[in-house]
Every structure is written in C-alpha cells, then in structure tokens.
Interface confidence: medium
C-alpha cells in the first residue's frame, strides 16, 4: 500500500469548495472491501498507481479511501434509489489529489491525479440494493458499475435491476 498515512491528514477543507461547485454533504474515511471480504488496495508501480483486490494477511493494515458524498441533480437510469429524483453520488480518493476514475472506453477503473473541479468520470451514483453493501454506478455511463474482475476493479455492465445484487459489484465500507 502506498502513502496511506497521508490520507489520515485529510481535512474537510481539502475536499470542500469547488468540486462541481458544491460541497459534499458528508465525508467518510473507510476501507473498501468486496462482498467476499477481499480488500481493495492501492500500490505505486512504475510511477503509476495500481488497484488490487486481494486477501490481506491477518495483521496487514487496510488501505483507506476518503468517500465524499454529493447530491446529484440527475436521477440514475437504475430506478429505485432516489427520492424526488435526487441521487447520492460519491467520489473516492485513496490519497491526496488522486481519485478513482471510470475509463469507459477500456472498461477499467483507474487512479488519476486531477484538479478541481473533478471530471464527471470521478463521480459514482451510490446504490444500496443488498443489505449493508453498496454499489457504485458510473455517472458518465448509467448501468455500468464498479466491479471485481480477475483481482482488479473493472467496469461492469448491469442489464437489469435484479442484477444489482450480483456479488461482484457489491462493496462494504469499514472504519477498521
């Protein structure tokens, strides 16, 4: 895992202000894991960041991600999660100035360094279709979700609302 100690130093001031011109309604520092309790980890390799899905050793520290929650003016194609047409969107940042991005052309999830305001590819609509798990739908490509494929994060097309409970697009958040 890379420089995660830096994420502990986040303050609201770093992430408030100008993202899409609004402030997040809240922020949450959490480790991200799959439905099957594999951890999402981040590693610096050849000056670029890689995202892995892996089993951690018992005492190995989990990487943390800062989730910033925003109101969206745009309802998702996948119905049923918004009240009055409003959705919650999140951005996910594992370290300062880097955010998860949806690369819809490559069907991949990547870490990009970028400045505010963040591009739409860094925003994901939050869904809660299965118990205490959440799913992340691309703002830029409705019906496409962050998922797990071959021990990496990838973009996965979900054809119907029943498939929103598919395990490979379900994630858990934890403070530990």
């Amino acid at each position: 895992a890379f420089g995660i100690s830096g994420v502990q130093k986040y303050t609201r001031a770093l992430h408030d202000s100008s993202i899409t011109g609004i402030s997040p309604i809240t922020e949450y520092l959490a480790s991200l894991s799959t439905y099957n309790d594999q951890s999402i980890t981040f590693a610096l390799e050849d000056e670029s960041y890689e995202i892995y899905v892996e089993d951690l050793k018992k005492d190995e520290k989990k990487d943390k991600v800062l989730l910033s929650y925003y109101e969206s003016q745009h309802p998702s194609n996948e119905s049923g999660d918004g009240v009055d047409g409003k959705m919650l969107m999140v951005t996910l940042s594992p370290t300062k100035d880097f955010w998860l991005h949806a690369n819809n052309k490559e069907h991949s999830v990547e870490l990009h360094k970028c400045e505010k305001p963040l591009p739409d590819q860094a925003f994901f609509v939050l869904h809660n279709m299965h118990s205490n798990c959440v799913s992340f739908e691309c703002k830029t490509d409705p019906g496409v979700f962050i998922g797990v494929k071959d021990n990496h994060l990838a973009l996965i097309k979900v054809d119907s609302s029943e498939n929103l409970c598919t395990e490979n697009i379900l994630f858990k958040l934890s403070e530990t």
């Epitope: 919650l88 809660n128 994630f171």
Partner: nanobody, 124 residues
C-alpha cells in the same frame, strides 16, 4: 440538510409498551438509513435499531431483539420504534439518526444527522 424530530417519549411501567416517532424533513435519499440510539445517564450512546430507507433490512442490538421493532411510514416520512416488554434498564434518551448505507450500522459515527432526542423512563 435533513431535520429529525423525535416524539412519543414518556413514563411507562416495567412490562409496558411505548412507541416513539421520528419525523424527517428536508432532502432524503434511498441510500440513507435511519437508526435509533439511546443514552442513559452517565453512559455512552448505544445503538438500538436501524432500518434502510426502503424498509427491507433491519438491524437490532442484542439487548432489544424480540422486544423492539423499527418501521417506517413512507407517506409521512416517519420512522417508529415500537418498544414492548420495557425494562428499567431501557430508561434513556432516545435519538433518531440518519446515516449512509454501507457504513457500519451500529456505529454512531456512521450517522450524519441527529435529532434532539426524546426521554423514555421505565419505572414503577
């Protein structure tokens, strides 16, 4: 911003029942969940029960399972905590809170909006 107003607290005898209510106003989302917490004098705030916005999943503290029930009236945007077989140790201020799904359900830090609380006293 979400505003939460609790009501329905009061004095009840051991073994009795009480229903407390939490009316929510402001902008709400289906990826929110509503929880009830309680705090007895001199003790830390503790989780009681939680319900997701579409009322499909509930969670209860072991100490209230089988006695308390959480429910929602979507038309009134109100969440209820029905408390049966009340015990003196249930005496506390009861707080309604709204959190975001996916965060640890029993932790107070998972909840971002809080009501002012309503007092429940169980005594003969």
């Amino acid at each position: 911003q979400v505003q939460l107003v609790e009501s329905g607290g009061g004095l009840v005898q051991p073994g009795g029942s009480l229903r407390v209510s939490c009316a929510a106003s402001g902008r709400t989302f289906n990826t929110f969940r509503t929880g009830w917490f309680r705090q007895a004098p001199g003790k830390e705030r503790e989780f009681v029960a939680s319900l997701n916005w579409s009322s499909t999943w509930t969670s209860y503290a072991d100490s209230v399972k089988g006695r308390f029930s959480i429910s929602r009236d979507s038309a009134k945007n109100t969440v209820y905590l029905q408390m049966n077989s009340l015990k003196p140790e249930d005496t506390a201020d009861y707080y309604c809170a709204v959190g975001i799904a996916g965060t640890p359900v029993m932790r107070a830090t998972s909840y971002i909006y809080w009501g002012q609380g309503t007092q429940v006293t169980v005594s003969s």
